[in-house]
Interface confidence: low
Amino acid sequence: TIPPHVQKSVNNDMIVTDNNGAVKFPQLCKFCDVRFSTCDNQKSCMSNCSITSICEKPQEVCVAVWRKNDENITLETVCHDPKLPYHDFILEDAASPKCIMKEKKKPGETFFMCSCSSDECNDNIIFSEEYNTSNPDLLLVIFQ
């Protein structure tokens, strides 16, 4: 992915299509890499990342990674290709419009990760169980 500080007009000729043949152009994601965070014990948090980046490749989605250990809490926001693992995990929820955090097993820390496919969707990371993407009401709100 391009450095997040570089504002870039979309200029590559690669066209990626979804399963319905609809063209997907590069997405907008929060892209602050790893930053210290105060997000803890909340149903949802804002990233507090002021950098919005146009993802380098059309197939990339937004990703957020929340990590807590004995010393600190960090939040990572990036663009990433869902065909490739990130932190050794597959991005299972890349098609979701919202960034719904799911816990992953990592020794020595608490590790949550989410991915999503709407503009800047990794700006609002959701931990609450009530925001399950299998909830038809949520999908109705997003896709109406």
Epitope: S9, V10, D13, K24, L28, T52, E120, V141
Partner: antibody, heavy 122, light 107 residues
């Protein structure tokens, strides 16, 4: 049903200011980039500005840069265009439009408001 | 800025005719090309995005083709409600410029 309703247009003298508003309903406003496009009387369409869902990314046309400011209030589902130092050539119908979710911030606009007329004249 | 040039600027046609409007970009824009229809006193309406993808709810008589610098909007059988002005727009780079429009009038 997606609806976009512009307001705030009117007659203003050269050098004056106006603030346009666009009230959005029927969709999840905060995840859509929004644009302003204008059309001078009897002329074609001219893109003015775009703002991403959170307001984190903004672009302007060179013709309005430094004079116009786009903003949004996601809690009110409202898009704004603050227009300062207005000129006669800014006279146009101003449309607010929703950028379709085609992953390109300056991409196709799938829903448009009815427009509001701004007339700059002494 | 990328210049978009439409031709013709106007045309006269009859109901049932096949109508073709072309749009040329001043540099390659891949498939980042959209088509809009505008009727007098109304807002534009998206017909085609990404050069050839039909927007939801748009009749199948509208189709788009092309890539690079040359694009075409085709109306296979002109209907009374199709008399309007048509605009192309590139969304390859900022600013997303429009063509000057093609007015389709009744012969």
């Amino acid at each position: 049903e997606v609806q976009l309703v512009e307001s705030g247009g009117g007659l203003v003298q050269p050098g004056g200011s106006l603030r346009l508003s666009c009230a959005a309903s029927g969709f999840a406003f905060d995840i859509y980039a929004m644009t302003w496009v204008r059309q001078a009387p009897g002329k074609g369409l001219e893109w003015v500005s775009v703002i991403s869902g959170s307001g984190g990314t903004i672009y302007y046309a060179d013709s309005v840069k430094g004079r116009f400011t786009i903003s949004r209030d996601n809690s009110k589902n409202t898009l704004y265009l603050q227009m300062n130092s207005l000129r006669a050539e800014d006279t146009a119908v101003y449309y607010c439009a929703r950028r379709g979710q085609y992953r390109d911030i300056v991409g196709a606009t799938d829903y448009w408001g009815q427009g509001t007329l701004v007339t700059v004249s002494s | 800025d990328i210049q978009m040039t439409q031709s013709p600027s106007s045309l006269s046609a009859s109901v049932g005719d096949r109508v073709t409007i072309t749009c040329r970009a001043s540099q390659s824009i891949s498939s980042y090309l959209n088509w809009y229809q505008q009727k007098p006193g109304k807002a534009p309406k998206l017909l085609i995005y990404a050069a050839s993808s039909l927007q939801s709810g748009v009749p199948s008589r509208f189709s788009g083709s092309g890539s690079g610098t040359d694009f075409t909007l085709t109306i296979s059988s002109l209907q009374p409600e199709d008399f309007a002005t048509y605009y192309c727009q590139q969304s390859y780079s900022t600013p997303p410029t429009f063509g000057q429009g093609t007015k389709v009038e009744i012969k």
